[in-house]
Interface confidence: low
């Protein structure tokens, strides 16, 4: 069998809402993946599991099942959404994300994704992780790749 390539493209959109009383931020982050089947037979994308970390803490998880099949030598672009919650010991971020007298509210999130594919009863897992900028101060739609964060630094804690 030839390889199945998974490429994490980036954040497509991030929609934000707040709970003032709980000092909590809710971010629905939609990500884009390209999955390429380099084989001469179809493969099934059985599931995608994803999680998002902020400051080494998991703030959101998602799992998509029975997603699609990819034909021979074909590629499919798949969007998946991870609902995240920044709260409790990270509620100090509420101050940052809602302060109006600063312009940029970018936070650095680590996106982790695992794609499980099957063909002829065989199962294969491919994982990727990437640091991304996400604006927690407003709803944002990104050009693909626009939110990439190359210098892998942790935010101040």
């Amino acid at each position: 069998p030839r390889s199945i390539d998974v490429k994490y493209i980036g954040v497509k959109s991030a929609y934000v809402s707040y709970d003032v009383q709980k000092r909590t931020i809710y971010l629905n982050i939609t990500n884009t993946l390209n999955i390429t089947n380099n084989n001469y037979y179809s493969v099934e994308v059985e599931n995608i599991t994803a999680q998002v970390q902020f400051a080494k803490t998991v703030i959101g998880k998602a799992r998509l099942n029975n997603i699609t099949h990819i034909g021979p030598l074909d590629m499919k672009q798949i969007d998946y959404t991870v609902p995240t919650v920044i709260a409790e010991e990270m509620s100090y971020m509420y101050d940052f994300c809602t302060l109006i007298s600063i312009k940029v509210h970018n936070i650095v999130l680590m996106m982790q994704v695992t794609v499980t594919t099957t063909y002829f009863g065989h199962s294969e897992q491919i994982s990727q992780e990437r640091y991304q900028y996400v604006d927690c101060g407003r709803n944002t739609t990104y050009q693909l790749g626009q939110s990439e964060y190359l210098n892998v630094l942790q935010p101040q804690q």
């Epitope: 509420y94 940052f96 109006i100 007298s101 600063i102 936070i107 101040q156």
Partner: antibody
Framework: QVQLQQPGAELVKPGASVKLSCKAS????????MHWVKQRPGHGLEWIGN????????HYNQNFRGKATLTVDKFSTTAYMHLSSLTSEDSAVYYC????????????????WGQGTSVTVSS | DIVMTQAAPSVPVTPGESVSISCRSS???????????LFWFLQRPGRSPQLLIY???NLASGVPDRFSGSGSGTAFTLRISRVEAEDVGVYYC?????????FGSGTKLEIK
């Protein structure tokens, strides 16, 4: 250590213009906004505006629109304020001050100030 | 624009005593995030302003704990306990909730 260096004094003629400088050192210049503040003799402090050195985004006090223009030179880590059509009302000490913006710790804004440049408008 | 009012142009104080300096804003500086965006600065004679208090009640780095800030959304107090000679100068409040940022007119601390 953090330093904001400003020239001590400028003497200019009425109707002329002047470009004040504020040389920053000891920190990452593009991570902090630069504010400019005016203080006339015997008067209080007046906020002129600020500039984000990372992309030159500016905010101005409406009272200074057309009077002050804020710019930066990232390479020399220097902020500038150009004052035009000077009158005696513009005779004052002008301070620059930094404040953190777009980061996780924006609390201690305007924590470092320059020594101020005294501008005298006189013929 | 938000107007910052410091009603007392000056306050006399005896060294070792405590003093309070007040400031009012024309609009609440309490943000929905629970923070109050008010600074206090001290300008000593012939010097640049120095940050004392940020977000109404947080002591800036290197500032003695004799200084403290308190208040509500529109009424604020800077308290100095055990006043020392080096505390003389003009105290300014400033809001940074909205542009343009605005200062109070200042209150001069004078030693009796």
């Amino acid at each position: 250590q953090v330093q904001l260096q400003q020239p001590g004094a400028e003497l200019v003629k009425p109707g002329a213009s002047v470009k004040l400088s504020c040389k920053a050192s000891g920190y990452t210049f593009t991570s902090y906004w630069m504010h400019w503040v005016k203080q006339r003799p015997g008067h209080g402090l007046e906020w002129i505006g600020n500039i984000d050195p990372s992309d030159s985004d500016t905010h101005y006090n409406q009272n200074f629109r057309g009077k002050a223009t804020l710019t930066v030179d990232k390479f020399s880590t220097t902020a500038y304020m150009h004052l035009s059509s000077l009158t005696s009302e513009d005779s004052a000490v002008y301070y620059c001050a930094r404040s953190r913006g777009g980061t996780y710790d924006y609390g201690e804004a305007m924590d470092y100030w320059g020594q101020g440049t005294s501008v005298t408008v006189s013929s | 624009d938000i107007v910052m009012t410091q009603a007392a142009p000056s306050v006399p104080v005896t060294p070792g005593e405590s003093v309070s300096i007040s400031c009012r804003s024309s609009k609440s500086l309490l943000h929905t995030n629970g923070n109050t965006y008010l600074f206090w600065f001290l300008q000593r004679p012939g010097r640049s302003p120095q940050l004392l208090i940020y977000r109404m009640s947080n002591l800036a780095s290197g500032v003695p704990d004799r200084f403290s800030g308190s208040g509500s959304g529109t009424a604020f107090t800077l308290r100095i306990s055990r006043v020392e000679a080096e505390d003389v100068g003009v105290y300014y409040c400033m809001q940074h909730l909205e542009y343009p940022f605005t200062f109070g007119s200042g209150t001069k601390l004078e030693i009796k």
